[in-house]
């Protein structure tokens, strides 16, 4: 277990021309707040999976009013850190989304209005327990400067927060085979207390005798990769005859969703659908009102004036979930053509095209030969997204620029000797053979297998292959 901490240093206009207009005005004073969303692994940061590692909202920043005619300065920020607690092991690689939100404090009917100013995303490697990492990200004309770190909560230590530390039993040194717990030199690494056989790569424990699995692994010892099982009964007994790997308890067994949330399995983990008034990975966050800005992605918050009354998020098109935190999977309609890979970036769909195709939806079949010349009389042949040159005799290579060695393939049969010639190759046949490639034996009586030798050529003479 541990905490991911994010410190926002500044949010303001980025360098270069085209400074953004101030988001606040004398008529519409406003204040900023931030949201961070963390996901494990180096997944596409835009892929709209839940914030499986956790999410956090900052406090509101000081009220800011634009000075007329002045350029937008760095805007006043909320105090304190954004903290995202994680219960399990720190994954080491993670994706983040940091959103900068504006709360307008004018005379809006129904309270303040929220709008998304900027969203930055990235993928990083980070060891728990390390120093603060500094980062700068740009979103349009805005620039966000921030630092982040992951730290373990005692007694956990290590780069993944999976090792446990205990106070020393003896003042001088740790017990046999146990190391001091850096940086807590006055503590000792606890002995391994996981269940016997628990995978050291894919399992960990927080209590003696348990074996808890990292994401993507299952089974009592975390040795079975999570995959679609071919078993008829997904949790039935293992069959030695079918060689069927049976996963351990399902991610929804025991319902990890708190406060009446309903659990549904996803390919790699689980997802909680929370009742109104609750959110978070396991519906553990409660007492939220509209003043807390619980509706993401431009959702409109209604009701929820005090912690005891539920709020409702009215989501804009394309978003869903009790807090508008989930994106509708638009890629399931397969808008990319010609086998292109679809990516939903939120503000737009993007297609990664296969070789030979281009365009926003991979709709353009590239003319492979356009602008490509084959040298030395070669002709261009299209196919499979790559151009190919059919070369004239005596030339080779991708663009027919290399002079081919016609003898490289040893074309002369029966020991004939090959000579390169401007028009191709010439075979000097060994005694007893003739033909352009010395392929015909000469019969002992002097007659060849051919009806007749061409005039002027005797058996054994070099045969020119034209």
């Amino acid at each position: 277990a541990g905490v991911f901490e994010l410190q926002i240093h500044s949010f303001g206009p980025g360098p270069g021309p085209g400074a953004p207009r101030s988001p606040c005005s004398a008529r519409l004073p406003c204040r900023l707040f931030f949201r961070v969303c963390l996901k494990p692994g180096l997944s596409e940061e835009a892929a709209e999976s839940p914030c499986a590692l956790g999410a956090a909202l900052s406090a509101r920043g000081p009220v800011y009013t634009e000075q007329p005619g002045a350029p937008a300065p760095d805007l006043p920020l909320p105090d304190g850190l954004l903290q995202v607690p994680f219960r399990d092991a720190w994954p080491g690689t993670f994706s983040f989304i940091i959103e900068t939100w504006r709360e307008e404090l004018g005379d809006q009917i129904g309270g303040p209005a929220w709008s998304l100013l900027a969203r930055v995303a990235g993928r990083r490697r980070l060891a728990a327990g390390g120093p603060w990492a500094r980062d700068i990200q740009r979103a349009g004309a805005w620039e966000l400067r921030f630092s982040y770190r992951a730290r373990c909560e005692p007694p956990a230590v290590g780069t993944a927060c999976t090792r446990l530390c205990r106070p020393r039993s003896a003042p001088s040194r740790c017990g046999p085979g146990l190391r001091p717990c850096a940086p807590l030199e006055d503590e000792c690494e606890a002995p391994l207390v996981c269940r016997a056989g628990c995978s050291p790569e894919h399992g960990f424990c927080e209590q003696p005798g348990e074996c808890r699995c990292l994401e993507g692994w299952t089974g009592p010892l975390c040795t079975v990769p999570v995959s679609t099982s071919s078993c008829l009964s997904p949790r039935g007994p293992s069959s030695a005859t079918t060689g069927c790997l049976v996963p351990g308890p399902g991610p929804c067994d025991g319902n990890p969703c708190a406060n009446g949330g309903s659990c549904s399995e996803t390919p790699r983990s689980f997802e909680c659908t929370c009742p109104r008034g609750f959110y978070g990975l396991r519906c553990e966050v409660s007492g939220v009102t509209c003043a807390d800005g619980p509706c993401f992605n431009g959702g409109l918050c209604v009701g929820g004036a005090d912690p005891d009354s539920a709020y409702i998020c009215h989501c804009p098109p394309g978003f869903q979930g009790s807090n508008c935190e989930k994106r509708v999977d638009r890629c399931s309609l397969q808008p990319c053509r010609n086998g292109g890979l679809c990516l939903d970036l939120g503000h737009a769909l993007r297609c990664r095209c296969r070789a030979g195709f281009a365009g926003p939806r991979c709709e353009h079949d590239l003319d492979d030969c356009a602008g490509r010349a084959c040298a030395n009389g070669g002709t261009c042949v299209e196919g499979g997204g790559a151009h190919r040159c059919s070369c004239a005799l005596g030339f080779g290579g991708r663009d027919c620029r290399e002079r081919a060695d016609p003898c490289a393939a040893r074309p002369c049969a029966h020991g004939g000797r090959c000579y390169a010639h401007f028009s191709g190759l010439v075979c000097a046949c060994a005694p007893g053979y003739m033909g352009a490639r010395c392929e015909f034996p000469v019969h002992p009586d002097g007659a060849s297998a051919l009806p007749a030798a061409p005039p002027g050529l005797r058996p054994g003479d070099p045969q020119r292959y034209l």
């Epitope: 397969q334 990319c336 769909l349 991979c362 709709e363």
Partner: nanobody, 119 residues
């Protein structure tokens, strides 16, 4: 701007049939991909059936063999013929389209039409 207008929803008994229509209107646009999504109360909005960018039909596993999508290009309309309806098909059905306007592509949603399956 492209408008998608759904119609044809209503209440039907299990085993019954309904035909939904989605008409696209606007100026100077061409449809790249179009289809139907549905959202039951408290659930996610999921794709039901559609025409992909390549013009191929695609269906969710849960509706294969029961639902059929078709289109009338002249009318810029897509249809969803739903038969052997079940209680779990109850949802708001949304038309969705990936549309080319000028040189850019934009995604549009309809307002939705409610389909209720109950005895």
């Amino acid at each position: 701007e492209v408008q998608l207008v759904e119609s044809g929803g209503g209440e039907v008994q299990p085993g019954g049939s309904l035909r939904l229509s989605c008409a696209a209107s606007g100026s100077d646009f061409s449809i790249n991909a179009i289809g139907w999504y549905r959202q039951a109360p408290g659930k996610q909005r999921d794709m039901v059936a559609g025409f992909t960018g390549d013009g191929v039909t695609t269906y969710a596993e849960s509706v294969k063999g029961r639902f059929t999508i078709s289109r009338d290009n002249a009318k810029n309309t897509v249809y969803l013929q739903m038969s052997s309806l079940r209680a779990e098909d109850t949802a708001v059905y949304y038309c969705a389209a990936d549309v080319k306007i000028g040189g850019d592509y934009e995604w549009f949603w309809g307002q939705g039409t409610l389909v209720t399956v109950k005895p």
